[in-house]
Amino acid sequence: APVPPGEDSKDVAAPHRQPLTSSERIDKQIRYILDGISALRKETCNKSNMCESSKEALAENNLNLPKMAEKDGCFQSGFNEETCLVKIITGLLEFEVYLEYLQNRFESSEEQARAVQMSTKVLIQFLQKKAKNLDAITTPDPTTNASLLTKLQAQNQWLQDMTTHLILRSFKEFLQSSLRALRQM
């Protein structure tokens, strides 16, 4: 697994550096998760031809992956800090069940998948500290998540591979949009 944020060689070599601000820490945490996703995507793409497949729509019907849209206030046009922050946190909470699904989907990158999951939990905590309106954040229902997980795990091998690919791609895209939005805050 990659070195967690704040523990890279640059930080070790430069103990005199200013401690990271809350925004920098969040930014670094997201980039750390994105690096983890890249490694997982590499294994997925090497193992199957899912990354080139045009049959994504078949698997996407089973998924309700969080997506960023204009109304969420995260784009430069119509940017709204509080609305956007709620969307980012809500989206990450919704992704947690899908990250749980990924846990048994990797052979050589099992540790990496765990690191992505745990780092996302830490990121949610960072962002919750930043949010003023925690009441607006809806937490997914555990029962619904449990049955979704069972349903995903019962799919055939091809659909499971496709689902893995789609989760990684969507999570990467969601995080990148979040990164871009948080830099405006």
């Epitope: 920098e24 994105l34 997506k67 204009e70 990467k172 871009r180």
Partner: antibody, heavy 120, light 106 residues
């Protein structure tokens, strides 16, 4: 071959509109950040706008915000820069380019540039 | 917009010289900075990205350093083909450039 082919430049009067096109080949714009950069005659490079492939989110420089619109047509693998309310200071060579990476980008591919002249 | 301030604007040097160009960002941009070289009538060409990573095919005499707000491009031993204009560009938010440094023959 991986390349960006630009078109649409020309002479336009102040207050007028122009649309620049940038056709990509050898890669898909639907999975890449795209960017427009301009350069006034004898001056430096100025970033104009970028378009993030995911959800088509666009970001603009303050100097063009509200006047320029960057868009794309995935079926044509082409990005556009719609320029309205043009001013003399918008004159220059406009480059279409591709960001090379997602969360720490740099430009790794440039178009040849197209000249836009705003003059009466 | 993030403002990038590059210095000097013009630099006169000779072949074999070691030269340094600096770039300062108006706010912290982590390591999200690239350096480009541009010759008259041509599109720019990337030399360094992520502040210190050398682009493939770029001679090792070019190096970059810095993080946060202060960045440096160094050419260890100038070659005749290095006389050009150099730009820094941040990619933290948007993609603003420095105003450029024209490197000319002394």
């Amino acid at each position: 071959e991986v390349q960006l082919v630009q078109s649409g430049g020309g002479l336009i009067q102040p207050g007028g509109s122009l649309r620049l096109s940038c056709a990509a080949s050898g890669f898909t714009i639907s999975s890449n950040y795209m960017i427009w950069v301009r350069q006034a005659p004898g001056k430096g490079l100025e970033w104009v706008s970028d378009l993030y492939y995911y959800a088509g989110d666009t970001y603009y420089a303050d100097s063009v915000k509200g006047r320029f619109t960057m868009s794309r047509d995935i079926s044509k693998n082409t990005v556009y820069l719609q320029m309205n309310s043009l001013r003399a200071e918008d004159t220059g060579v406009y480059y279409c380019a591709r960001w090379a990476d997602d969360h720490a980008p740099w430009v790794d591919l440039w178009g040849r540039g197209t000249l836009v002249t705003v003059s009466s | 917009d993030i403002v990038m301030t590059q210095s000097p604007s013009t630099l006169s040097a000779s072949v074999g010289d070691r030269v340094t160009i600096t770039c300062r960002a108006s706010q912290g941009i982590s390591s999200w900075l690239a350096w480009y070289q541009q010759k008259p009538g041509r599109a720019p060409k990337v030399l360094i990205y992520k502040a210190s990573t050398l682009e493939s095919g770029v001679p090792s005499r070019f190096s970059g350093s810095g993080s946060g707000t202060d960045f440096t491009l160094t050419i260890s031993s100038l070659q005749p083909e290095d006389f050009a204009t150099y730009y820094c560009q941040q990619s933290w938010l948007g993609g603003s450039f420095g105003q450029g440094t024209k490197l000319e023959i002394k």
